[in-house]
């Protein structure tokens, strides 16, 4: 059988090899494709529903206005000239659709050396056959299960056109003394030969030194963390990281519902204040961090330090975020 | 202690290729990258090119089809090959360790080699 | 290509005083900037990387400063072994140095 191959949504011709060129002819064209149950015989004379899917031309050529999915296959025509001499003809129709430019969705802008970092998802949509997606750093490709590396891959088929969408999320754990500013794309690559891959539009991330865990610093002031009623208690969370990360704040173990900032304010303390007081400073692409965790407490008029075992009350009074 | 250290040929005719070896201590090569900057007499400082601790590389565009960096990690060594040299190319050739990723930048220095391109 | 403007390219100052360098990047180099001394018959020498983080054993009388494109370095309380010609590098995107500053005694 001879190899066609044909776009979906565009018209297929197939030839019947030793048909007169006019009628009257004696030919049968048989069909089994995804449209038919075993071998749907068309004729000449055609007429009916199968018309607008395939016709016989007065050539008596095969003519596919529009090729669909359903339509991959076994086409063969049966000729008889006007001697009398058959000739077959049998062709194997295999359909394809180009996807769309693949794009990178939820790309990082940086990553941390030395921990497993998201670089990003590479989707292709509308594909048939399915084709495969395929991540390159600095050009090459990218092998999964390879020096930190690793992909997870998805695919999806439209339930109404039946073409695929192609999903793939690529982790890399940066090893010391690469590049810091990597170049990753994406290419897909399409199921049937003789068309080319499909390239992203490159991403650059930026790759940063790992923070240290011990150096997120909680500095108290006043110094200890003991203050009179109605005094202020500034808490500031120090983390040498760049860029900055985000900082949330927590009291007793749970986090405070407050939006992320480096300095917590506790203004006019009041009992509801005391507890225990942390920061968790949460960097693109890296796990949290804690800090050590400071207990607030409220010295009572004429007494020394703090009072010794004090938790006060879940109430959060009045905080500031400077 | 971080120590860089370059050799080269001190002299170049013209039209012909330069090779110039940096010969590493105190650190590994399979952890750390490595430039090139050259600086012409009364010059400023030219970056030409890096080789990464996994063997990738990165060009200067404008110098790219003449250079070509490579490395022998089990003798700390990296090279730099420049073709086609002209006068122009006189200049102190410098090898130079990158301090790690960002917010690091390139941090310890050879003393250089001279590099004379005449006839 | 990121381009570096340094400026001044020659600077004549007294011991003890304060001098300033400034680098204007062609675009946003992100705060990505290191600064260099460079004496005679030496390779460079870090003294400044991401704008203002000194460089262990660099004296705290050298500092550095900016974003967006434009960015400065100082030293302050100048000492005899302070001259020598200074560079700024920017390293966001690629490698481009400035074109040195010169520092003399007046």
């Known amino acids: 059988a001879q190899n066609i191959t044909a776009r979906i949504g565009e018209p297929l011709v197939l030839k019947c090899k030793g048909a007169p060129k006019k009628p009257p002819q004696r030919l049968e064209w048989k069909l089994n494709t995804g449209r038919t149950e075993a071998w749907k015989v068309l004729s000449p004379q055609g007429g009916g529903p199968w018309d607008s899917v395939a016709r016989v031309l007065p050539n008596g050529s095969l003519f596919l206005p529009a090729v669909g999915i359903q339509d991959e296959g076994i086409f063969r025509c049966q000729a008889m000239n006007r001697n009398g001499k058959e000739t077959k003809s049998n062709y194997r129709v295999r359909v394809y659709q180009i996807p769309g430019k693949p794009e990178i969705v939820d790309s990082a802008s940086e990553l941390t050396a030395g921990v497993p970092n998201k670089v990003g998802t590479c989707v292709s949509e509308g594909s048939y056959p399915a084709g495969t997606l395929s991540w390159h750093l600095d050009g090459k490709p990218l092998v999964p299960n390879e020096k930190g590396v690793s992909v997870k891959e998805q695919t999806r088929r439209h339930p109404e056109t039946g073409l695929f969408t192609l999903q793939s999320e690529l982790m890399v754990t940066p090893a010391r003394g690469g590049d810091p500013r990597p170049t990753f794309s994406c290419s897909f690559s399409p199921g049937l030969p003789r068309h080319r891959a499909l390239r992203t539009a490159p991403i650059q991330p930026r790759v940063w030194e790992p923070v240290p865990l011990e150096e997120v610093q909680l500095v108290v002031e006043p110094e200890g963390g003991a203050v009179a009623p109605g005094g202020t208690v500034t808490l500031t969370c120090e983390v040498p990281a760049q860029p900055s990360p985000q900082i949330h704040w927590m009291k007793d173990g749970v986090p405070l519902p407050l939006p992320p900032s480096p300095v917590l304010i506790l203004p006019e303390i009041g009992p509801q204040d005391q507890g225990t007081y942390s920061c968790v400073a949460t960097h693109s692409s890296h796990g949290p961090q804690e800090s050590r965790a400071v207990s607030i407490s409220i010295i009572e008029p004429g007494e020394e330090g703090p009072t010794a075992g004090s938790v006060g009350g879940s109430g959060l009074g009045t905080l500031a975020l400077a | 202690q971080v120590q860089l250290k370059e050799s080269g040929p001190g002299l170049v005719a013209p039209s012909q290729s330069l090779s110039i070896t940096c010969t590493i201590s105190g650190f590994s090569i399979t952890s750390y990258g490595v430039h090139w900057v050259r600086q012409p007499p009364g010059k400023g400082l030219e970056w030409l090119v890096v080789?990464?601790?996994?063997?990738?590389?990165t060009y200067n565009s404008t110098l790219k089809s003449r250079l070509s960096i490579s490395k022998d990690n089990s003798k700390s060594q990296v090279f730099l090959k420049m073709n086609s040299l002209q006068t122009d190319d006189t200049a102190m050739y410098y090898c130079?360790?990158?301090?790690?990723?960002?917010?690091?930048?390139?941090?310890?220095w050879g003393q250089g080699t001279s590099v004379t391109v005449s006839s | 290509d990121i381009q570096m403007t340094q400026s001044p390219s020659s600077l004549s100052t007294s011991l003890g005083g304060k001098v300033t360098i400034t680098c204007k990047a062609s675009q946003d180099i992100n705060k990505f900037i290191a600064w260099y001394q460079h004496t005679p018959g030496k390779g460079p020498r870090l003294f400044i990387y991401?704008?203002?983080t000194l460089q262990p054993g660099i004296p705290s009388r050298f500092s550095g400063n900016g974003s967006g494109r434009d960015y400065s370095f100082s030293i302050s309380n100048l000492e005899p072994e302070d001259i020598a010609t200074y560079y700024c590098?920017?390293?966001?995107?690629?490698?481009?140095f400035g074109g040195g500053t010169k520092l003399e005694i007046k």
């Open positions: 590098l920017q390293y966001d995107n690629m490698y481009t």
């Open positions: 991401y704008t203002s």
């Open positions: 130079v360790r990158h301090g790690g990723y960002f917010p690091y930048a390139m941090d310890y």
């Open positions: 080789i990464w601790s996994d063997g990738r590389t």
